[in-house]
């Protein structure tokens, strides 16, 4: 990895568990304006492996709202607009970081948590197991 | 939203910008074991809109390594294994939270940042613009 010289103007950490516990500014720097995935594109409808987006809310988590994709079909949509079960719609999953309130119900104390979310679906060729 | 009663055992916040600046425990609670997306599934190879994963490293960011998907083709793979340009491979993107060191090079001070990452690709029917 790349080593970085420490900035002499850094805040001091008086925490015994340093560097495990850090200060985080929640004033988000957002390079993108779209937050609702339904508005960002219509791929979920136009895909050969279309999906629906489900709202997952948890007030003990930051962000409290996460959108989860669920594939509409087990198969994929063919050129005639029908479901072809010789192909499979599968979820594309990604591990993301969220902040979990710890201790619970505390407004200013969090712990990092990794969760797996389904972002959308893709159409794949099935793995065929041949029986000897 | 849902209102939560405050836990009386919460740490005190002496920061003037509270609740903007919070304490975060970086000892990640991880519900998942796979971290390398190439190991988690082979969908990126079996998809009709296959993709490659590129490593994006930034030591000023946490996590410092993020994997970015690039679709291998502009079209999609048809039943014969050829690229069909009547369909489009498109990236499925997701906004994720990362921690950005602020001030720069500080080990214990961060700011939340939202970035857009490509997680994988899906095959979509193109939008055809008819000229009058």
């Amino acid at each position: 990895g790349i080593t970085i010289p420490r900035n002499p103007g850094c805040p001091n950490s008086e925490d015994k568990n340093f560097p495990r516990t850090v200060m985080v500014n929640l004033n988000i720097h957002n390079r993108n304006t779209n937050t609702n995935p339904k508005r960002s594109s219509d791929y979920y409808n136009r895909s050969t492996s279309p999906w629906n987006l489900h709202r997952n809310e948890d007030p003990e988590r930051y962000p409290s709202v996460i959108w989860e994709a669920k594939c509409r079909h087990l198969g994929c949509i063919n050129a005639d607009g029908n479901v072809d079960y010789h192909m499979n719609s599968v979820p594309i999953q990604q591990e993301i970081l969220v902040l979990r309130r710890e201790p619970p119900h505390c407004p200013n104390s969090f712990r990092l948590e990794k969760i797996l979310v389904s972002v959308g679906c893709t159409c794949v060729t099935p793995i065929v197991h041949h029986v000897a | 939203g849902i209102t939560i009663p405050r836990n009386p055992g919460c740490p005190n916040s002496e920061d003037k910008n509270f609740p903007r600046t919070v304490m975060v425990n970086l000892n990640i609670h991880n519900r998942n074991t796979n971290t390398n997306p190439k190991r988690s599934s082979d969908y990126y190879n079996r998809s009709t809109s296959p993709w490659n994963l590129h490593r994006n490293e930034d030591p000023e960011r946490y996590p410092s390594v993020i994997w970015e998907a690039k679709c291998r083709h502009l079209g999609c793979i048809n039943a014969d294994g050829n690229v069909d340009y009547h369909m489009n491979s498109v990236p499925i993107q997701q906004e994720i939270l990362v921690l950005r060191r602020e001030p720069p090079h500080c080990p214990n001070s961060f700011r939340l940042e939202k970035i857009l990452v490509s997680v994988g690709c899906t095959c979509v029917t193109p939008i055809v613009h008819h000229v009058a």
Epitope: R31 | C71, H73, L74, V90, S118, C121
Partner: nanobody, 113 residues
């Protein structure tokens, strides 16, 4: 098929400047996110700079404040303005359709006194 044709590059002294260009055919610059990557000898290809269709830019850690990505939709061309060049910027630079494995032919930039 999309073609990306690069120009610019060459030998420059430390502290100097260079501008790379990337012309696309057909017209894709305005409708696709674009990026510049580079690959130094014996290293992985790394993101230098990206620009979205809405003009939002992002930069690799080591070039922030020195490099600027821009595009001219009318000329269907992507640019990379490189200032205050350092020896560690020496690499082959590639223009890229950001979310696709579509690349320019590569341009060598050498920073040396």
């Amino acid at each position: 098929q999309v073609q990306l044709v690069q120009s610019g590059g060459g030998l420059v002294q430390p502290g100097g400047s260079l501008r790379l260009s990337c012309a696309a055919s057909p017209r894709v610059i305005s409708i696709h996110d674009m990026a510049w990557y580079r690959q130094a000898p014996g290293k992985e290809r790394e993101l230098v700079a990206g620009i979205t269709t809405r003009g939002i830019t992002d930069y690799g850690y080591s070039v922030k404040g020195r490099f600027t990505i821009s595009r001219d939709d009318a000329k269907n061309t992507l640019f990379l303005q490189m200032n205050d060049l350092k020896p560690e910027d020496t690499a082959v630079y590639y223009c890229n359709l950001r979310h696709y494995e579509v690349w320019g032919q590569g341009t060598l930039v050498t920073v040396s006194s």
